[in-house]
Amino acid sequence: AGVFELQIHSFGPGPGPGAPRSPCSARLPCRLFFRVCLKPGLSEEAAESPCALGAALSARGPVYTEQPGAPAPDLPLPDGLLQVPFRDAWPGTFSFIIETWREELGDQIGGPAWSLLARVAGRRRLAAGGPWARDIQRAGAWELRFSYRARCEPPAVGTACTRLCRPRSAPSRCGPGLRPCAPLEDECEAPLVCRAGCSPEHGFCEQPGECRCLEGWTGPLCTVPVSTSSCLSPRGPSSATTGCLVPGPGPCDGNPCANGGSCSETPRSFECTCPRGFYGLRCEVSGVTCADGPCFNGGLCVGGADPDSAYICHCPPGFQGSNCEKRVDRCSLQPCRNGGLCLDLGHALRCRCRAGFAGPRCEHDLDDCAGRACANGGTCVEGGGAHRCSCALGFGGRDCRERADPCAARPCAHGGRCYAHFSGLVCACAPGYMGARCEFPVHPDGASALPAAPPGLRPGDPQRYL
């Protein structure tokens, strides 16, 4: 479960000739409100079809009366966000319709009159929990500027709001391979777990317990290459029993990419590579400059001071595409269990397992708890033929026999001083450095290499590492 949030920034005349007349006048004062309709997937349905993901109506904006002779300015907007709650998983791809409505406040018989001023629609790919995405849409002579995001409602987390947070079993840490739930730091993430044994290279899941195969693979665990020799066409859904590919239309048939975008098939859908100046799922958004914030996911926009000159997005690691709209990192789904390190090799995912674990997803624990004692108050944790000593604070090692000095490994970088602490260690950073282990330099202009220091901590303050 979660909430889709829409922030309208401006609604007014678009650039170019033929500015629209103001919708309000001294004789007919009016005010605006907005309606948003969301549908899952890349719906081509008519505007009248149900808003299956949900819909919302804004508050009424301030009353506006046109000044005689003045061009139509940006019109005054309602306060606040439009929020569309969704009950199930966030679908990742969605279609939207945003309508701008006018409420006339003259002396009409029977109360206010409503009329639709503009309707814009689009299709987007969006991960829940990500940053605000900015957009511009034009409807006739009007232009709408807005931002949107999807966020999960606790206890759901993850890019589809399908992973759940659960209370920690131990006060100081989460289990192996599980992260704390931001912003519920006292809870732990319960990862989306595919069917046990599902191939990490060729399988994936969108619902817990399933194992769906990438194109070209079949079998219960997606470990069997599809044989296409006896098939009519090497495309389409695979039959579970025969492993033969049934012919079907390709996602790029008829080129869904507008404005000269090139289409490439992906395992589950298609992807448009857009020429400069265009973006959106199908390259349908245009006339964009750096001022419009076209670079998603923290990309840096360079050039493009006016609509005719190209801009370039410099993407942060893990993102690509002309607008940094494509996520590269498949490890974000945390496929490696038991604290394994995920490596995205491009052609495949690999899990580098912690000592004592093995298997494609580090799902097998190699040890046996039977007859094993954990010293110094440590407890032996069983699971699937597995053993692990969970040591009391201050102790470590395989059997909790070693007295753990959290400062022994010199964890504080750049000359920071380390202090043992009941819950771990504290680094007191040298001037000019910050972070849990003093790993981040504070830039001379005052901005840090971190997105932000945690609330209540200034750069240079001691930071506890749990």
């Epitope: 777990v193 069917r195 046990a196 044994g197 619902q207 817990p208 317990g209 399933e210 079949t218 079998g219 219960p220 665990l221 470990t223 069997v224 579970a240 029993t241 492993g243 298997g359 799902e363 097998h364 699937g384």
Partner: antibody, heavy 118, light 107 residues
Framework: QVQLVQSGAEVKKPGASVKVSCKAT????????IEWVRQAPGQGLEWMGE????????VYNEKFKDRVTMTVDTSTSTVYMELSSLRSEDTAVYYC???????????WGQGTLVTVSS | DIQMTQSPSFLSASVGDRVTITCKAS??????VAWYQQKPGKAPKPLIY???YRYSGVPSRFSGSGSGTEFTLTISSLQPEDFATYYC?????????FGGGTKVEIK
């Protein structure tokens, strides 16, 4: 502790249908496949098919696909296996099993004996 | 369908013996093989998964090995409670298939 509890023994005439239930407790029902396996008297094990309760997705053994239907009632955490057009060679113990956190049938029901006799 | 051919079908052994059961797949199934133990009138119990990993609570005298088409279940020192029928199973391809079983009897 995970439990799968199956419905009681059934006696059916040839040509009839039988519907066996499997009620699951003490785990997240929607997240794990339920498998159906049968065992004729004195014989080995034969896989019939599977269903993932969270999605309703089913995969059937080709041998049974025209006669078997697997369904789920999430409100009661129960999976059903219906076999139609029964013949005498369908006399067997029918087991449900859960594909668990490791790649195997981790938990099994106690079995339901279905006898087909005229 | 993939055939899983188990041998021997019957095996007589004494307490303390080392027992080996083999299972041959008619085509490559990687390491996607499990072993189960079944006693008369009871449901099968899981022993080994992914060819060589012991399931929770299974004694260390049970071990599995192999890959591709040849798989082995070994009981290093047979105990009285081990007299039962053992089945291999492949879950690499649909339909999932079991071996015909090996009945381990007291000599």
């Amino acid at each position: 502790q995970v439990q799968l509890v199956q419905s009681g023994a059934e006696v059916k005439k040839p040509g009839a249908s039988v519907k066996v239930s499997c009620k699951a407790t003490d785990y997240i029902f929607s997240n794990y496949y339920i498998e159906w396996v049968r065992q004729a008297p004195g014989q080995g094990l034969e896989w019939m098919g599977e269903i993932l309760p969270g999605t309703g997705n089913t995969v059937y053994n080709e041998k049974f696909k025209d006669r078997v239907t697997m369904t789920v009632d999430t409100s009661t955490s129960t999976v059903y296996m219906e076999l139609s057009s029964l013949r005498s060679e369908d006399t067997a113990v029918y087991y449900c099993a859960r594909w668990g956190d490791y790649a195997l049938f981790a938990n099994w029901g106690q079995g339901t004996l279905v006898t087909v006799s005229s | 369908d993939i055939q899983m051919t188990q041998s021997p079908s019957f095996l007589s052994a004494s307490v303390g013996d080392r027992v080996t059961i083999t299972c041959k797949a008619s085509q490559n199934v990687g390491t996607n093989v499990a072993w189960y133990q079944q006693k008369p009138g009871k449901a099968p119990k899981p022993l080994i998964y992914s060819t060589s990993y012991r399931y929770s609570g299974v004694p260390s005298r049970f071990s599995g090995s192999g890959s591709g088409t040849e798989f082995t279940l070994t009981i290093s020192s047979l105990q009285p409670e081990d007299f039962a029928t053992y089945y291999c199973q492949q879950y690499n391809n649909y339909p999932l298939t079991f071996g015909g079983g090996t009945k381990v009897e007291i000599k």
